[in-house]
Interface confidence: medium
């Protein structure tokens, strides 16, 4: 069976004009998943991203996340790239006062 992930992108303010953007994938199966931040379509280097492990979410499916810190005002340059069971998609950082974007694919 294949259950595609729900993707949720959030922003949280941090100091000195930087923000942390977090991309969460949840409710997916099987466990193997690609999750990374891209800037202008290019994957960020590994040491600029932080990942959570892929863990059970209690419903027979899995969840994980990736986060990175970016300059405030540059949100439109960043997307979260997801690949799972042959499907893939990119999810933008929400702009303005909207702090979350959720999509099912």
């Amino acid at each position: 069976r294949t259950v595609p992930p729900m993707v949720n992108v959030t922003c949280s303010e941090v100091s000195e004009g930087n923000i942390t953007v977090t991309c969460r994938a949840s409710s997916f199966y099987p466990r193997n998943i690609t999750l990374t931040w891209r800037q202008d379509g290019v994957s960020l280097s590994h040491n600029t991203q932080q990942w959570g492990d892929v863990l059970p979410d209690g419903n027979g499916t899995y969840q994980t996340w990736v986060a990175t810190r970016i300059r405030q005002g540059e949100e439109q340059r960043f997307t979260c790239y997801m690949e799972h069971s042959g499907n893939h998609g990119t999810h933008p950082v929400p702009s303005g006062k909207v702090l979350a974007l959720q999509s099912q694919w």
Epitope: N32, T34, L35, T36, S43, H46, Q49, W51, D53, V54, L55, P56, V66, Y81, E83, G86
Partner: antibody
Framework: QVQLKQSGPGLVQPSQSLSITCIVS????????VHWVRQSPGKGLEWLGM???????DYNAAFISRLSINKDNSKSQVFLKMNSLQADDTGIYYC?????????????WGQGTSVTVSS | QILLTQSPAILSASLGERVTMTCTAS???????LHWYQQKPGSSPKLWIY???NLASGVPARFSGGGSGTSYSLTVSNMEAEDAATYYC?????????FGSGTKLEIK
């Protein structure tokens, strides 16, 4: 820095079991998973199985009946036990850290435990 | 399981030469999950290239990787003595995760 140090016997009798301990430092087993891989002249590199941060395990179907992987987070130790060893189980056994994120590559390897199965 | 076939088994190259080795998968592998490791005699393998084309930390820029689907390659643009080693491809696309049999790169 990240290190995986292995200990275990070099010689195992046929039909007996193999136990190897992998002690990790520089990272936490609550943050990273660990693979076990072996290397032999006849079969090359073979993935045996892995343990995730939450303690769940995935095994290569070819070994699932005689392999178990466990860990002790507080002691930063991962354990491999393989039963019913035969001559073709001779090889070097590695514990390997599972890289994070979008690539899941095996990013740090232990020094290996050389195992000979012989009477 | 996915079989990875590496060729050639042994690759002899002169210093300064450009060399390419290949890894062919028996079924399609996502480029995100195709990795390369370098191993020298008496040492453990080291992560060398991850996700087809990304160099691991400390790997010289003369190395590059490419490919998609069932066909992948590792290239050394300017062979140096320290590059002599065995290189293994590896797929994390589908369990059981598998490795190629290796290409031994040696100095001619």
């Amino acid at each position: 820095q990240v290190q995986l140090k292995q200990s275990g016997p070099g010689l195992v009798q046929p039909s007996q079991s193999l136990s190897i301990t992998c002690i990790v430092s520089g990272f936490s087993l609550t943050t990273y998973g660990v693979h076990w891989v072996r290397q032999s002249p006849g079969k090359g590199l073979e993935w045996l199985g892995m343990i995730w941060t939450d303690g769940t395990t995935d095994y290569n179907a070819a070994f699932i009946s005689r392999l178990s992987i466990n860990k002790d987070n507080s002691k930063s130790q991962v354990f491999l036990k393989m039963n019913s060893l035969q001559a073709d189980d001779t090889g070097i056994y590695y514990c390997v850290r599972k890289g994070h994120g979008y690539y899941y590559a095996m990013d740090y390897w232990g020094q290996g435990t050389s195992v000979t199965v012989s009477s | 399981q996915i079989l990875l076939t590496q060729s050639p088994a042994i690759l002899s190259a002169s210093l300064g030469e450009r060399v390419t080795m290949t890894c062919t998968a028996s079924s399609s592998v996502s480029s995100s999950y195709l990795h390369w490791y370098q191993q020298k005699p008496g040492s453990s393998p080291k992560l060398w290239i991850y996700s087809t084309s990304n160099l691991a930390s400390g790997v010289p820029a003369r190395f590059s990787g490419g490919g998609s689907g069932t066909s992948y390659s590792l290239t050394v643009s300017n062979m140096e003595a320290e590059d002599a080693a065995t290189y293994y491809c590896h797929q994390y696309h589908r369990s059981p995760f598998t490795f190629g049999s290796g290409t031994k790169l040696e100095i001619k």
